[in-house]
């Protein structure tokens, strides 16, 4: 079952899946000026069994100029901005699959891929949160979210994480700020499942065990 919604937005935090549950789908998308190769795949799917899973198919992009069958609507302004947290500067070091049966590693980058990877997660997927550079974590519990099925509908659990600026007055647990959406857009219109292949981990060592997962696996 696909998780129909995005993992929760936490102000000044990003999230990352350490590995992808079997059944996860990754859209094959290309950056501006590039298209999928002729007869290219629409998506990749994490398939397999409890002992071994891998991504079926692969995504490939080519320059738009080489195809005369394309039409391109002018992108919205937000699509033309520079990559920020979604920058893919280097391939990640994937989590050791031996400890995660039924999961796929992060697919390696493909040439001219889009600035964001759009994953469609399945029930049971877990994502981990950490504060962005310049913010530190205040914890009430695990900084993670799990997609669960309840009453026939999917939902993500709320991560127990507050990210506060160094100079800000620390918030007390329970005094969470309203959840903000990127660029002030309504949550239903924020980019979908923006999970990135490089987290540019520069968070303080004072952050928590969850953060150490990021730094050890991805720095």
């Amino acid at each position: 079952e696909l998780c129909d919604d995005d993992p929760p937005e936490i102000p000044h935090a990003t999230f990352k899946a350490m590995a992808y549950k079997e059944g996860t789908m990754l859209n094959c998308e290309c950056k501006r000026g590039f298209r999928r190769i002729k007869s290219g795949s629409l998506y990749m799917l994490c398939t397999g069994n409890s002992s071994h899973s891998s991504w079926d198919n692969q995504c490939q992009c080519t320059s738009s100029a080489t195809r005369n069958t394309t039409k391109q609507v002018t992108p919205q302004p937000e699509e033309q901005k520079e990559r920020k947290t979604t920058e893919m500067q280097s391939p990640m070091q994937p989590v050791d699959q031996a400890s995660l049966p039924g999961h796929c590693r992060e697919p390696p980058p493909w040439e001219n891929e889009a600035t964001e990877r759009i994953y469609h997660f399945v029930v049971g997927q877990m994502v981990y949160y950490q504060c962005v550079q310049g913010y530190r974590a205040l914890h009430r519990g695990p900084a993670e979210s799990v997609c669960k099925m309840t009453h026939g509908k999917t939902r993500w659990t709320q991560p127990q994480l507050i990210c506060t600026g160094e100079m800000e007055t620390s918030q007390f647990p329970g005094e969470e700020k309203p959840q903000a959406s990127p660029e002030g857009r309504p949550e239903s219109e924020t980019s979908c499942l923006v999970t990135t292949t490089d987290f540019q981990i520069q968070t303080e060592m004072a952050a928590t065990m969850e953060t150490s997962i990021f730094t050890t696996e991805y720095q």
Epitope: D4, D5, D6, L42, T47, Q72, T74, C192
Partner: antibody, heavy 115, light 107 residues
Framework: QVQLQQPGAELAKPGASVKMSCKAS????????IHWVKQRPGQDLEWIGY????????EYNQKFKDKATLTADKSSSTAYMQLSSLTSDDSAVYYC????????WGQGTTLTVSS | DIQMTQTTSSLSASLGDRVTISCRAS??????LNWYQQKPDGTVKLLIY???RLQSGVPSRFTGSGSGTDYSLTISNLEQEDIATYFC?????????FGGGTKLEIK
């Protein structure tokens, strides 16, 4: 629950254009591609193209690249397909469908091109 | 483009029967094969995706199998509500293409 709502019928004259809609509900519109499919009686289903509502990125079947134009309006969670220079060959049922493997479909819009 | 062929355009079966509908691709589609059901009123529903994955809410009497270029949909214990036309589709590469459909009727 997930729904894709399409008007039941459209009537247009040869040479004219028509713009049909597909209103999405029950999910976050920008998270999933919207595909369009043509069905004529006694013929195979034909994929026209898709739009990614998040970015307005479109891909078309070569056969329909000069016939169809796909757009999306995020504010109303509605995808549109405009068909131009209509002929009797364009008379068909047109479906919108969601996602990479077409997991939900609209009820279809029957387009009749007649003078 | 990849051609999808459903050699049987119609078939009749009795309630309770086990029915198999086949589909062949003109080239290897790496299991990127989906099955759809179209009811007489035109309603279309995804049954199986990626060869054998049952779509949420679809009864378990529907199963899919196959690999390479040859795929099949099996309906065990046929029910009245299964009367419909069944289409296969490849989503391995653009453009996605459909089989011609197999119309299932009750004897």
């Amino acid at each position: 629950q997930v729904q894709l709502q399409q008007p039941g019928a459209e009537l247009a004259k040869p040479g004219a254009s028509v713009k049909m809609s597909c209103k999405a509900s029950g999910y976050t519109f920008t998270r999933y591609w919207i595909h369009w499919v043509k069905q004529r009686p006694g013929q195979d289903l034909e994929w026209i193209g898709y739009i990614n509502p998040r970015t307005d990125y479109t891909e078309y079947n070569q056969k329909f690249k000069d016939k169809a134009t796909l757009t999306a309006d995020k504010s109303s969670s509605t995808a549109y397909m405009q068909l131009s220079s209509l002929t009797s060959d364009d008379s068909a049922v047109y479906y919108c469908a969601r996602h990479g493997y077409f997991d939900y479909w609209g009820q279809g819009t029957t387009l009749t091109v007649s003078s | 483009d990849i051609q999808m062929t459903q050699t049987t355009s119609s078939l009749s079966a009795s309630l309770g029967d086990r029915v198999t509908i086949s589909c062949r691709a003109s080239q290897d589609i790496s299991n990127y094969l989906n099955w759809y059901q179209q009811k007489p009123d035109g309603t279309v529903k995804l049954l199986i995706y990626h060869t054998s994955r049952l779509q949420s809410g679809v009864p378990s009497r529907f199963t899919g199998s196959g690999s390479g270029t040859d795929y099949s949909l099996t309906i065990s214990n046929l029910e009245q509500e299964d009367i419909a036309t069944y289409f296969c589709q490849q989503s391995n590469s653009l453009p996605p293409t459909f089989g011609g459909g197999t119309k299932l009727e009750i004897k």
